[in-house]
């Protein structure tokens, strides 16, 4: 659902959330293009691209939250993800520079689709929270009560280090979306039933 419009149909909304999380755990849509564009596609460099522990909630943590708590945590985490993605985008090469280097412009386009897709997912998370009657969540089109700041490494001027930090963040993001997808897959057919 875009622009704050919400479906009132639980199964349809859950289906959209599952589809969105399936897409977002796919590394070919974000991490892999980032690695290619940033010149990290070398075995020795890829080894350095590991998820930073604690950057994202674990699947175990998410499972222990209950539906409302899970949606609130997901909403807040996606807000932080949007900040980091915007920051990563700002430091990507320009399209004309990619062309000169013989790199694939489609990789840049994939990276630039990430933020709108996260926005769409976050809107559906908000809609699901409304459906479950959770009034605590900030409407996605309004400024919040201060967005929780992301667990960001101290900003560095070292270009290579920045690339590695971006890579680690994206690896963690894909893992997180995989965990989110697994949690949603256990949700039942109705708003008040879960599959164990």
């Amino acid at each position: 659902a875009a622009m704050g419009s919400c479906s009132k149909e639980y199964r349809m909304l859950l289906g959209q959330l599952q589809k969105q999380t399936d897409l977002m755990q796919d590394t070919s849509r974000l991490l892999d293009p980032y690695i290619r564009i940033q010149g990290l596609d070398i075995p020795k460099l890829r080894e350095h691209c590991r998820e930073s522990p604690g950057a994202f909630p674990s699947e175990e943590t998410l499972r222990g939250l209950g539906r409302r708590g899970f949606l609130q945590t997901l909403n807040a985490t996606l807000g932080r993800v949007l900040h980091r993605l915007a920051d990563l985008e700002q430091h990507l090469p320009k399209a004309q520079d990619l062309e000169r280097s013989g790199l694939n412009i489609e990789d840049l386009e994939k990276l630039q689709m990430a933020r709108p897709n996260v926005l769409g997912l976050r809107n559906n998370v908000y809609c699901m929270a409304q459906l479950l009657d959770n009034s605590d969540m900030t409407e996605p089109t309004k400024a919040g009560r201060g967005t929780p700041q992301p667990p960001t490494p101290t900003p560095t001027s070292d270009v290579f280090q920045r690339k590695l930090e971006g890579c680690s963040f994206l690896r963690g993001y894909h893992r997180f979306m995989h965990s989110v997808g697994r949690v949603f897959s256990k949700w039942g057919e109705s708003p008040n039933r879960s599959r164990r």
């Epitope: 949007l82 985008e89 201060g146």
Partner: antibody, heavy 121, light 111 residues
Framework: EVQLVESGGGLVQPGGSLRLSCAAS????????MSWVRQAPGKGLEWVAT????????YYLDNVRGRFTISRDNAKNSLYLQMNSLRAEDTAVYYC??????????????WGRGTLVTVSS | DIVMTQSPDSLAVSLGERATINCRAS??????????MHWYQQKPGQPPKVLIY???NLESGVPDRFSGSGSGTDFTLTISSLQAEDVAVYYC?????????FGGGTKVEIK
């Protein structure tokens, strides 16, 4: 009443520095991303820089990156723009603006009245 | 960077008549069902004022004679019945990616 008031503009020589301030009132400043937008005399609008609510993230127009620094002090409800190595083409009215809407895809809903920066020898 | 091209540069319309301003982006500013395009009005000696956000949403307090439409690369601001107080310069703005960029402006006058 929601209000933004800029100050710190003036005449400065090329290569010089200036620090603009923006005092916010009437809203929870620490909850909003904020931006600077400028307008050269008789010309259109140009986005200059944006800072996140907690100050962790900053975004700049390419031709000011490395010369301008956007910062904020949430305790003082204030936004700043430190401008170094000023050039004639930086001459403009500088507006402070509040960012609202979808996270990172903002638009500007509240603007100050602007402060004029003139770079000339 | 995305270049925003506004047309026409200026427009003279009779009171009560329709005024239409166009904005074309050098690449799509829509994605995932969202249109990241906004419209502003600026009167002489004043800061800009938002009229329309996300292509078609009317900002609170703005008269409903203003409307916005479009998606992808082509967007339109329409004033259905021009009033004397609508004389101003109008700008489009995209927020699809950084840097956000404005159109060059359209000056609207009374014929």
């Amino acid at each position: 009443e929601v209000q933004l008031v800029e100050s710190g503009g003036g005449l400065v020589q090329p290569g010089g520095s200036l620090r603009l301030s923006c005092a916010a009132s009437g809203f929870t400043f620490s909850s909003y991303w904020m931006s600077w937008v400028r307008q050269a005399p008789g010309k259109g609008l140009e986005w200059v820089a944006t800072i996140s609510d907690g100050g962790s993230f900053t975004y700049y127009l390419d031709n000011v990156r490395g010369r301008f620094t956007i910062s904020r002090d949430n305790a003082k409800n204030s936004l700043y723009l430190q401008m170094n190595s000023l050039r004639a083409e930086d001459t403009a009215v500088y507006y402070c603006a509040r960012d609202v809407g979808h996270t990172t895809f903002w638009y500007f809903d509240v603007w100050g009245r602007g402060t004029l920066v003139t770079v000339s020898s | 960077d995305i270049v925003m091209t506004q047309s026409p540069d200026s427009l003279a319309v009779s009171l009560g008549e329709r005024a239409t301003i166009n904005c074309r982006a050098s690449k799509s500013v829509s994605a995932a069902g969202y249109n990241f395009m906004h419209w502003y009005q600026q009167k002489p000696g004043q800061p800009p004022k938002v009229l329309i956000y996300y292509a078609s949403n009317l900002e609170s307090g703005v008269p409903d004679r203003f409307s916005g439409s479009g998606s992808g690369t082509d967007f339109t601001l329409t004033i259905s019945s021009l009033q004397a107080e609508d004389v101003a310069v109008y700008y489009c703005l995209h927020s699809r990616e950084f840097p956000f960029t404005f159109g060059g402006g359209t000056k609207v006058e009374i014929k």
